[in-house]
Interface confidence: low
Amino acid sequence: EPPTACREKQYLINSQCCSLCQPGQKLVSDCTEFTETECLPCSESEFLDTWNRETRCHQHKYCDPNLGLQVQQKGTSETDTICTCEEGLHCTSESCESCVPHRSCLPGFGVKQIATGVSDTICEPCPVGFFSNVSSAFEKCRPWTSCETKDLVVQQAGTNKTDVVCGPQDRQRA
């Protein structure tokens, strides 16, 4: 009696079980009563990553340099190419189909987390006692200068965008 189901790594066709092609190979012809499944390796720019009965291999992903992409891991006959973003850019999506430049933190904000190839810069407002006077993708909020440690006094208070201004203490006359 012909089978209704096949073992793992097999498929049912014309009332018989044929072997699937292994990863990295595509199906050329199904098995028959007298011949085994015929498979062929994928070409250099193609891949198949599962046991399959595909008649065409998949094209490797193209890491488009004009979209800021570069190859992180070259594809093989069994794996797709993995793209990542060039330095200074990060992916716009999980599948990393294009990249955008890292955001800069504006004055009054500092970098909480530096951007990576897959995540943007995370900025945070400078808390009281800290400032940032630059637009930067890597500078944290800096602490206000401590005038006291320099034997000076605060002449102008700091803000989230400016440092304090220190000046000499007024000398008391006798």
């Epitope: 004009n66 979209l67 850019l89 294009s98």
Partner: antibody
Amino acid sequence: QLQLQESGPGLVRPSETLSLTCSVSGASMNTNNYYWGWIRQPPGKGLEWIGSGYYNGNTYYNPSLKSRVTISVDTSKNQFSLKLNSVTAADTAVYYCARQTPPRIIGSPNIWGQGTMVTVSS
Amino acid sequence: DIQMTQSPSSLSASVGDRVTITCRASQSISSYLNWYQQKPGKAPKLLIYAASSLQSGVPSRFSGSGSGTDFTLTISSLQPEDFATYYCQQSYSTPPITFGQGTRLEIK
């Protein structure tokens, strides 16, 4: 010197497909340095980017038009084409083809064709 | 999509005037901003790319500045051939490339 020249019918009926071709002379399109794009300008209005094609077959479209647009690049003929289906009067515009330079992401259209007026009317 | 807003929509000026056109992006676009000039019946012409770089062959009276969300195009001394419509365009987050609505520069 690089030149781009649009060609195609100046009148298209509503609901039909607008087809334009851009012929490139003075340089090979078979290069990874440029995208080949289409931009349109309705009478008296501003510029709207339609999409771009790349020599390897990659295409990038304006999401607002994506469902109706096909751009293809034929490097053997040094041409690229635009197809816009299901047109309405709102698609009446001057259509420009352009070479786009990368600043990484699909960049500045820096060399343009002279434009061709397409009217959608019955 | 990133929206680009130009101001003013139109302005009148005289030959020799210094003219400034501004462009604002709906979110930060770093320096990924370009400026175009378009004359009636003609294709746009790239003047400035990457916010402040002058395209080859463009007169030095044109200059661009800004980064983030606010940008300006300045013509230091207006010439008769400068009367045209000017567009800004972002290429930071694409597709799509987006243009400003244009600024029409007329003779006073």
